[in-house]
């Protein structure tokens, strides 16, 4: 690895550093499918963007292997806790990899938001935030799931979102 | 752009990399103004610092354009949910830009913390955390707002804070 | 500092950039000691890793000084709020430094999760997330504490965790 090679590497690194992989995807009316699949996301409009990562059917797809800080927030809300809806909400980030048939839990939260309703108001709001560093290989995917997704409130992309950046 | 130019760029980049923009601002007694404006923050004492970002009247001001992970946490608390205080709390990060007259919502949470009071204790505590990646131009500002800010509890700068770093 | 020196520095920086310090530690059965000490963490198995940081008795130990985004999430849960258990939970990240005899609060949250139990179910779940940028010197340590730790629920390392990366 001579000087020229090193030089090329440095130039290359500078260029790649300029596009340190990052993404921020936002909630949209189409996010909740009701199909049992992961949440879907807006990738281009408003605050949403992809830089050095790609997107496919709800998933952030890694193009460059490395350690990523991944995060998601979901806005929850309702009026009381209707029968048949889970009183415990699970919000999680999951990895899909060609090496395993099933999704792998990465970061997960469980909350009981309905208890936030008060005697004077049955309306409640709650928010769940997850964030942490995980190693991801090229081609691996990360998705967000919420059970029961009917309690997720979407409005304008600021209250429920999903993102990542390489660290 | 010859070798000398590239060399200068690399040297420059190395120097700028040494000061990757970052900041962490902390809550203080003066944070809550009651004026309807954004929360104000400590920028120097204790854990607070600014590196490659500046501060003005509650706002983190961007000096170098790019993608930033911005975050804020606020500690909420009270005794019961007094009449006339919002039972729904909105905690948000907002962008100010010379290009628009109004603030733009970036990341927002709504919570109903008063429902956390129990039959045995009217005291309740709750915490709201927001974080996400947004693109910011030089000169743009980010502020934190909480409605109703009277439910924000300040103590020592560790419970309510606001920060950012370039990714 | 001639061209050769600068070249060496750049090569060195590229190498160090490859190992930008980062870690993600996960909750395990041994995390809760009941001894009044900090939570303990898994450092190698599953999603856990250390890169450019070390670990000692629950603490992330800094080897390279700088600004770090540190974070922790704990999963809380219970059935009602048994007498003798604090109805207010404190979850915090604390710094240990050779320069002071006592731990220093960095980021702290207080929550009243028991209020999440509903009339129809005494079971409740809650989650607390903390994250923020702090300056850490080589040799300084960061630990996580939860009071009352008996309300922390551990399962598989995805619900309670602790991490950091240099920014």
């Amino acid at each position: 690895d001579g000087p020229a090679g090193s030089w090329e590497q440095l130039i290359q690194e500078r260029r790649s550093h300029e596009v340190n992989p990052a993404a921020h995807l936002t909630g949209a009316n189409s996010s909740l499918t009701g199909s049992g699949g992961p949440l879907l996301w807006e990738t281009q409009l408003g605050l949403a963007f992809l830089r050095g990562l790609s997107y496919h059917d709800g998933a952030l797809v890694v193009t460059k292997a490395g350690y990523y800080y991944i995060y998601s927030k979901v806005q929850l809300g309702g009026v009381g806790c209707p029968l048949g809806l889970a009183s415990t909400i699970t919000h999680g980030l999951y990895k899909r990899t060609p090496r395993y048939p099933e999704e792998l839990e990465l970061l997960v939260s469980q909350q009981s938001p309905c208890g936030r309703a008060t005697s004077s108001s049955r309306v409640w709001w709650d928010s769940s935030f997850l964030g942490g560093v995980v190693h991801l290989e090229a081609g691996e995917e990360v998705v967000v799931r919420v059970l029961d997704e009917r309690l997720v409130r979407l409005r304008d992309g600021t209250r429920s979102y999903f993102g990542a950046f390489m660290v | 752009d010859g070798p000398a130019g590239s060399w200068e760029q690399l040297i420059q980049e190395r120097r700028s990399h040494e000061v990757n923009p970052a900041a962490h601002l902390t809550g203080a007694n003066s944070s809550l103004t009651g004026s309807g404006g954004p929360l104000l923050w400590e920028t120097q004492l204790g854990l607070a610092f600014l590196r490659g970002l500046s501060y003005h009247d509650g706002a983190l001001v961007v000096t170098k354009a790019g993608y930033y992970y911005i975050y804020s946490k606020v500690q909420l608390g009270g005794v019961g949910c007094p009449l006339g205080l919002a039972s729904t709390i909105t905690h948000g990060l907002y962008k100010r830009t010379p290009r628009y007259p109004e603030e733009l919502e970036l990341l927002v949470s709504q919570q109903s913390p008063c429902g956390r009071a129990t039959s045995s204790s009217r005291v309740w505590w709750d915490s709201s955390f927001l974080g996400g990646v947004v693109h910011l131009e030089a000169g743009e500002e980010v502020v934190v707002r909480v409605l109703d800010e009277r439910l924000v509890r300040l103590r020592d700068g560790t419970r309510s804070y606001f920060g950012a770093f370039m990714v | 500092d001639g061209p050769a020196g600068s070249w060496e520095q750049l090569i060195q920086e590229r190498r160090s950039h490859e190992v930008n310090p980062a870690a993600h530690l996960t909750g395990a059965n041994s995390s809760l000691t009941g001894s009044g000490g900090p939570l303990l963490w898994e450092t190698q198995l599953g999603l856990a890793f250390l890169r450019g940081l070390s670990y000692h008795d629950g603490a992330l130990v800094v080897t390279k000084a700088g600004y770090y985004y540190i974070y922790s999430k704990v999963q809380l849960g219970g059935v009602g709020c048994p007498l003798g258990l604090a109805s207010t939970i404190t979850h915090g990240l604390y710094k240990r430094t050779p320069r002071y005899p006592e731990e220093l609060e960095l980021l702290v949250s207080q929550q009243s999760p028991c209020g999440r139990a509903t009339s129809s179910s005494r079971v409740w779940w809650d989650s607390s997330f903390l994250g923020g940028v702090v300056h850490l010197e080589a040799g300084e340590e960061v630990v996580v504490r939860v009071l009352d730790e008996r309300l922390v629920r551990l399962r598989d390392g995805t619900r309670s965790y602790f991490g950091a990366f240099m920014v």
Epitope: S120 | G77, V79, P82, L83, G84, L85, R150, R153, R155 | -
Partner: antibody
Framework: QVQLVQSGAEVKKPGASVKVSCKAS????????VHWVRQAPGQGLEWIGA????????SYNQKFKGRATLTADKSTSTAYMELSSLRSEDTAVYYC??????????????WGQGTLVTVSS | DIVMTQSPDSLAVSLGERATINCKAS??????????MNWYQQKPGQPPKLLIY???NLESGVPDRFSGSGSGTDFTLTISSLQAEDVAVYYC?????????FGQGTKVEIK
């Protein structure tokens, strides 16, 4: 300046009802609670309840729940306290007061001049 | 309900002297470093007037000879140098929980 002006004195028979008004001026009526406090002759102060004119929400001292009704009319910036099933021990001066907050701690920073309600057969 | 007990019931103090009124709550009225305790002054034929809120904060326009202190269950209102216009009945009041309750009052007179 902030002013709370109450209606005039009333004399009522036992079992009747009384409705006292409190007209606010000098501040945004919908942004503050209006509390009602009474003081029997030569006695101390007793909190009846409060109304939040912003949305009409109320909070009552259980002692008066069912007999006291607190309302507010945003269009006229006026709060009302109606007390039913009057008895002689309800004879008192009734005050309205504006409720402000320091964090979540309430205090009464402006008071009306008081309305004497006399219950006598 | 939280019971507020004031002492003494009445107090005679010389002009220019210090007057001290105590108030005891039946349970703590503290939260996160704040005490949910207020003090009012009432002169004959007038409504009460706010003096001190949250135990120690002086209401705007109130002379600084008035001060409040205390925490938990025990609170004090102090008039550092009694003036003739301070003759009145003084009430403590807790706003920690409904129903808000007042002390029975302390009458301050000139000796």
């Amino acid at each position: 300046q902030v002013q709370l002006v109450q209606s005039g004195a009333e004399v009522k028979k036992p079992g009747a009802s009384v409705k006292v008004s409190c007209k606010a001026s000098g501040y945004t009526f919908t942004s503050y609670n209006v509390h009602w406090v009474r003081q029997a002759p030569g006695q101390g102060l007793e909190w009846i309840g409060a109304v939040y004119p912003g949305n009409g929400d109320t909070s009552y001292n259980q002692k008066f729940k069912g007999r006291a009704t607190l309302t507010a009319d945003k269009s006229t910036s006026t709060a009302y306290m109606e007390l039913s099933s009057l008895r002689s021990e309800d004879t008192a001066v009734y005050y309205c007061a504006r409720g402000s907050y320091y964090y979540t701690s309430s205090y009464f920073d402006h008071w009306g001049q008081g309305t004497l309600v006399t219950v006598s057969s | 309900d939280i019971v507020m007990t004031q002492s003494p019931d009445s107090l005679a103090v010389s002009l220019g002297e210090r007057a001290t009124i105590n108030c005891k709550a039946s349970q703590s009225v503290d939260f996160d470093g704040d005490s949910y305790m207020n003090w009012y002054q009432q002169k004959p034929g007038q409504p009460p007037k706010l003096l001190i809120y949250t135990a120690s904060n002086l209401e705007s326009g109130v002379p600084d000879r008035f001060s409040g202190s205390g925490s938990g269950t025990d609170f004090t209102l102090t008039i550092s140098s009694l003036q003739a216009e301070d003759v009145a009945v003084y009430y403590c009041q807790q706003s920690y929980e409904d129903p808000f309750t007042f002390g029975q009052g302390t009458k301050v007179e000139i000796k």
